[in-house]
């Protein structure tokens, strides 16, 4: 069954890992998403008003992804970013960003996912988002659009 | 050289890790993979009949990426899914999903790939299969079209 | 803060991981990395002229993205290569690969992204590079194009 | 100028098998998918088959799937065509001809290497 | 499959006169028809793509129309070098070309 894990056997402490999934109530940015029902993972991280917040510092595995759809293809650019803040420094800092510009054919139901994955160092009480340009194109199907991170 | 992996000399238990690449003789859903020969890495999971099977309950980070491609753009409906099947559940389980809808212009030579990758809690006699819309659509080089995960 | 690993506390070695971000003075292939400011993480592995060489011998998660875009769409085929070169071997190894054609509007200002990730097992003194088909056509912002591995 | 120049043509016994070439100048090679195309004596025009600018795809017409195969070499700017079990079906000129820009017609051809296959 | 069927099979006409060669689809291709000249024993010329848009190179009493189903080849002042054999192609679905066209002097 897939869902909140058990601590792997191996280990003595518990593993730091989030699988978050679309959340279709999203009304603004940043996204919102689903951390209890379906396949979600949150252990170890918290899940505060859209965004991951680390509790250790340390380097993690960070990944996105995003599905864009619509009925009539108008081209208008998109954009999927992950992004981190931190009560420390005054700006976001966008980490990984994805951007599509001329992607379909005017007119035309459309539909495209966007990819985003790497490794980062990350500081306790920092806390990670996504952002999209054109919320009313987002599909939050769990297995179509979610977020994630674990722990080296 | 990239092949079969000796176990990691810091560990001692072996690393499960699987990378099986593209297999043209595929013929049905879902796909089949090359478990032997080439960059294929296969180690403490089992692959059967185009699946990969859980033998320990964990956390996977389990990936994909399949290279769609045509002669003549006529923007076929495009889908990309890993899922799950465990004999104690009755129906499949999609964990990942990528579609792509209008992505070619009419009558050009086209390519176009999906990812994806993420993290979820797998069970011991989880099967983790691949599936595609249009198998006639996939080149399956090794470096193109592939499969895998690891244990966190 | 985003910066350079301090080795994860519970852990004695170093971690193995490397996330280079774009560098706008790539003048030919493979493309060159920044090693140094910004989000980058460079620890137990060395960078040499665009490459991440590897010192120990064990299986790595590799990764890249690379941020493609043009004022004006001609559909000229993308490529992007993650590949390996060792000097026991003649050859060039193409471990992972992204292609695109026909993926924009003939005229249009556009842009796209080509991810890849997998695992392979890597052996001490490989050297991984990236190649990309239209170096013109490569946006180098650190949040766009990236290149990375960590050691499992 | 862009030439493409076919070799290899013959006469050939049903059953048998014939290699075409197709040396290419003028023009940068690797960068352009080739076809063949053929026309049979008296006939019109039938694609044959496509292979991509980097040979990593290769299509072919549902009458030569299976029997004919398509191939190139960038280092020799030259394009080839291996075709086995031939038929007398298979009788005529083959031409190979570049591709505009990955839009599946074509924009300079060869001069033509006929292919007889007959008892 | 789609099916291109050009008419006429064969056209008598004389220096000078206005020529048009028409080529059906047996479906919509939209505006992807390509036109070829060809000459006894010798390669296909390429002359127009994308229904009505004219190759470098190819004389501007050529031209192209149509869309959908129907598409046309007009010689709007035929010239000696003018009388060979004209195929249309479309590439909207894989590849298919007409029958040929063959453009005699009267």
């Known amino acids: 069954q897939i869902g909140h894990p058990s601590p792997p056997p191996e280990k003595k402490e518990l593993r730091k890992v989030a699988h978050l999934t679309g959340k279709s109530n999203s009304r603004s940015m940043p996204l919102e998403w689903e951390d209890t029902y379906g396949i979600v993972l949150l252990s170890g991280v918290k899940y505060k008003k859209g965004g991951l917040v680390i509790n250790e510092t340390g380097l993690y595995f960070v990944y996105s992804k995003v599905y864009f759809r619509g009925q009539s293809c108008n081209n208008l650019p998109l954009s999927h970013k992950v992004y981190m803040r931190n009560s420390k420094y005054p700006q976001d800092l966008v980490m990984m960003e994805g951007k599509m510009m001329s992607y379909c054919t005017t007119g035309q139901m459309w539909a495209r996912s966007s990819y985003l994955g790497a490794v980062f160092n990350l500081t306790s009480a920092d806390h990670l988002y996504v952002n999209v340009s054109e919320l009313s194109l987002v599909n939050f199907e769990e297995s179509q659009t979610f977020f994630g991170l674990y722990k080296l | 050289q990239i092949g079969h992996p000796s176990p990691p000399p810091e560990k001692k238990e072996l690393r499960k890790v699987a990378h099986l690449t593209g297999k043209s003789n595929s013929r049905s859903m879902p796909l089949e993979w090359e478990d032997t020969y080439g960059i294929v890495l296969l180690s403490g999971v089992k692959y059967k009949k185009g699946g990969l099977v859980i033998n320990e309950t964990g956390l996977y980070f389990v990936y994909s990426k399949v290279y769609f491609r045509g002669q003549s753009c006529n923007n076929l409906p495009l889908s990309h899914k890993v899922y799950m099947r465990n004999s104690k559940y009755p129906q499949d389980l999609v964990m990942m999903e990528g579609k792509m809808m209008s992505y070619c212009t009419t009558g050009q030579m086209w390519a176009r790939s999906s990812y994806l990758g993420a993290v979820f809690n797998l069970t011991s006699a989880d099967h983790l299969y691949v599936n595609v819309s249009e198998l006639s659509l996939v080149n399956f080089e090794e470096s193109q079209t592939f499969f895998g995960l690891y244990k966190l | 803060q985003i910066g350079h690993p301090s080795p994860p506390p519970e852990k004695k070695e170093l971690r193995k991981v490397a996330h280079l971000t774009g560098k706008s003075n790539s003048r030919s292939m493979p493309l060159e990395w920044e090693d140094t400011y910004g989000i980058v993480l460079l620890s137990g592995v060395k960078y040499k002229k665009g490459g991440l060489v590897i010192n120990e011998t064990g299986l790595y998660f590799v990764y890249s993205k690379v941020y493609f875009r043009g004022q004006s769409c001609n559909n000229l085929p993308l490529s992007h290569k993650v590949y390996m070169r060792n000097s026991k071997y003649p050859q060039d190894l193409v471990m992972m690969e992204g292609k695109m054609m026909s993926y924009c509007t003939t005229g249009q200002m556009w842009a796209r992204s080509s991810y890849l990730g997998a695992v392979f097992n890597l052996t001490s003194a490989d050297h991984l590079y990236v190649n990309v088909s239209e170096l013109s056509l490569v946006n180098f912002e650190e949040s766009q194009t990236f290149f990375g591995l960590y050691k499992l | 100028q862009v030439q493409l120049v076919e070799s290899g043509g013959g006469v050939v016994q049903p059953g048998r098998s014939l290699r075409l070439s197709c040396a290419a100048s003028?023009?940068?090679?690797?960068?352009?998918?080739i076809h063949w195309v053929r026309q049979a004596p008296g006939k019109g025009l039938e694609w044959v088959a496509v292979?991509?600018?980097?040979?990593?795809?290769?299509f072919y017409a549902d009458s030569v799937k299976g029997r004919f195969t398509i191939s190139r070499d960038n280092s020799k700017n030259t394009l080839y065509l291996q075709m086995n079990s031939l038929r007398a079906e298979d009788t005529a000129v083959y031409y190979c001809?570049?591709?505009?820009?990955?839009?599946?017609?074509?924009?300079?051809w060869g001069q033509g290497t006929l292919v007889t296959v007959s008892s | 499959d789609i099916q291109m069927t050009q008419s006429p099979s064969t056209l008598s006409a004389s220096v000078g006169d206005r020529v048009t060669i028409t080529c059906r689809a047996s479906?919509?291709?939209?505006?992807?028809l390509a036109w070829y000249q060809q000459k006894p024993g010798k390669a296909p010329k390429f002359l127009i793509y994308?229904?009505?848009s004219l190759e470098s190179g190819v004389p501007s009493r050529f031209s192209g129309s149509g869309s959908g189903t129907e598409f046309t080849l007009t010689i709007s002042s035929l010239q000696p070098d003018d009388f060979a054999t004209y195929y249309c192609q479309q590439y909207n679905s894989y590849i298919t070309f007409g029958q040929g066209t063959r453009l005699e002097i009267k």
């Open positions: 001809a570049r591709d505009r820009d990955n839009w599946n017609y074509f924009d300079y």
């Open positions: 292979i991509w600018y980097d040979g990593s795809d290769k």
């Open positions: 479906q919509s291709i939209s505006s992807w």
């Open positions: 003028g023009f940068t090679f690797s960068t352009y998918g």
């Open positions: 994308q229904a009505s």
